[in-house]
């Protein structure tokens, strides 16, 4: 029951996480900026992985997509790639984990197959979460190192003078959504991997047999297994590392067709 709960919870947590990763990837607010040097109106700029938007205090908002691929910063392309890989892996992981759920019966699928599928999906969720966290962190680092406070430095360019606008770049909501979503997917993946251990079938129950040597009153136990017919207290045939034989008084053995060779 605990295994089913762990597996189910892992699936739900991962599902929420992947939904969050998709949401973060689509969001426009990866970085937000206040443009200081505009004397007319407060201008608020925010950018995502796919488009940039300008919003004015007057209520005017306009967004424009990055329609080119080659001209964009390499860092932006890397973040896009990481997020997409995270989504794809997460989606495949979800698909695999649906079939791996213990509460869902599909034909005569064995527990070992379900265990393998649970482990596979768990690993996929972990990698997916790491991709999302890495993507968001790379973008955040890009903001911190390059743009945290662009100083108004002037220089002469083609057609006149150029200066960088003094802007303050801050983390957008998408970064926090991405971090949380990546973390949830990662946790969900770990839970799936833990559930996999519980799903793996028990070792085959070998019934150990007592061999009686004539003239000796000791029970020989191959492999250190406690001799049992399956009716005694040790029905699971757990291995006992007791380092040797016991007398017949200590371990009662019942005659069987294998007792005498």
């Amino acid at each position: 029951m605990a295994v089913t709960a762990c597996q189910g919870l892992g699936f739900v947590v991962s599902l929420i996480g992947i939904a969050g990763i998709i949401a973060a990837t689509c969001m426009d607010q990866w970085s937000t900026q206040d443009l200081y040097n505009n004397p007319v109106t407060a201008v608020f700029n925010y950018q995502g992985l796919w488009r940039s938007c300008v919003r004015e205090s007057s209520g005017f908002t306009e967004c424009r997509g990055y329609f080119t691929l080659l001209g964009l910063p390499a860092m932006l392309q890397a973040v896009r790639a990481l997020m997409i890989v995270g989504i794809v892996l997460g989606a495949i992981g979800l698909l695999v984990s649906i079939f791996a759920l213990k509460c869902i019966r599909i034909g005569s699928m064995e527990d070992s197959a379900k265990a393998n599928m649970t482990l596979t999906s768990g690993i996929m969720f972990i990698v997916s979460g790491l991709c999302a966290i890495a993507g968001v962190s790379v973008f955040a680092n890009m903001l911190v190192t390059n743009f945290w406070m662009s100083t108004a430095n002037m220089y002469t360019g083609m057609g006149g003078m150029v200066q960088t606008v003094q802007t303050r770049y801050t983390f957008g909501a998408a970064l926090f959504v991405g971090w949380v979503a990546g973390g949830l997917t990662l946790i969900g993946g770990v839970m799936m991997c833990i559930a996999c251990r519980g799903l793996a079938p028990e070792e085959t129950n070998y019934k150990a047999v007592s061999y009686h040597a004539s003239g000796h009153s000791v029970a020989y136990k191959p492999g250190g297994f406690k001799a049992s017919t399956g009716f005694g207290s040790n029905t699971k045939n757990k291995k006992i590392y007791d380092g040797g034989a016991r007398t017949e008084d200590e371990v009662q053995s019942y005659p069987s067709k294998h007792d005498y060779v």
Partner: nanobody
Framework: QVQLVESGGGLVQPGGSLRLSCAAS????????MGWYRQAPGKQRELVAV???????NYTDSVKGRFTISRDNAKNTVYLQMNSLRAEDTAVYYC????????????????WGQGTLVTVSS
């Protein structure tokens, strides 16, 4: 990379009119505010008028009611219609645009034109 080219300047009599235009070209991703500044001989450069992408405009007190700023976002062009010109309006008029580039849509730059001379004299 990016060029701002002003045109329309010249000599005009007091009370006359002129229409300045400024076209931005190059690898522009998005232009936010566009404006006109002027610098009279021996004076500091001052704001004349500025207009945002959404059409919100602002004017310096001395030109209010006489000058009108407008823009065409599709053409990346800003215009300054100057009416009832006075001698004190004589200056070099500079075009200004806040924009970001296609190669770096995360950083904003202010580009300036080379300027066009407006002389108001009888």
């Amino acid at each position: 990379q990016v060029q701002l080219v002003e045109s329309g300047g010249g000599l005009v009599q007091p009370g006359g009119s002129l229409r300045l235009s400024c076209a931005a070209s190059g690898s522009i991703f998005l232009i936010n505010a566009m404006g006109w500044y002027r610098q009279a001989p021996g004076k500091q450069r001052e704001l004349v008028a500025v207009i945002t992408r959404g059409g919100s405009a602002n004017y310096t007190d001395s030109v209010k009611g006489r000058f009108t700023i407008s823009r065409d976002n599709a053409k990346n062009t800003v215009y300054l219609q100057m009416n009832s010109l006075r001698a004190e309006d004589t200056a070099v008029y500079y075009c200004n645009a806040d924009l970001n580039l296609r190669s770096d849509p995360f950083k904003w730059y202010t580009f300036w034109g080379q300027g066009t001379l407006v002389t108001v004299s009888s």
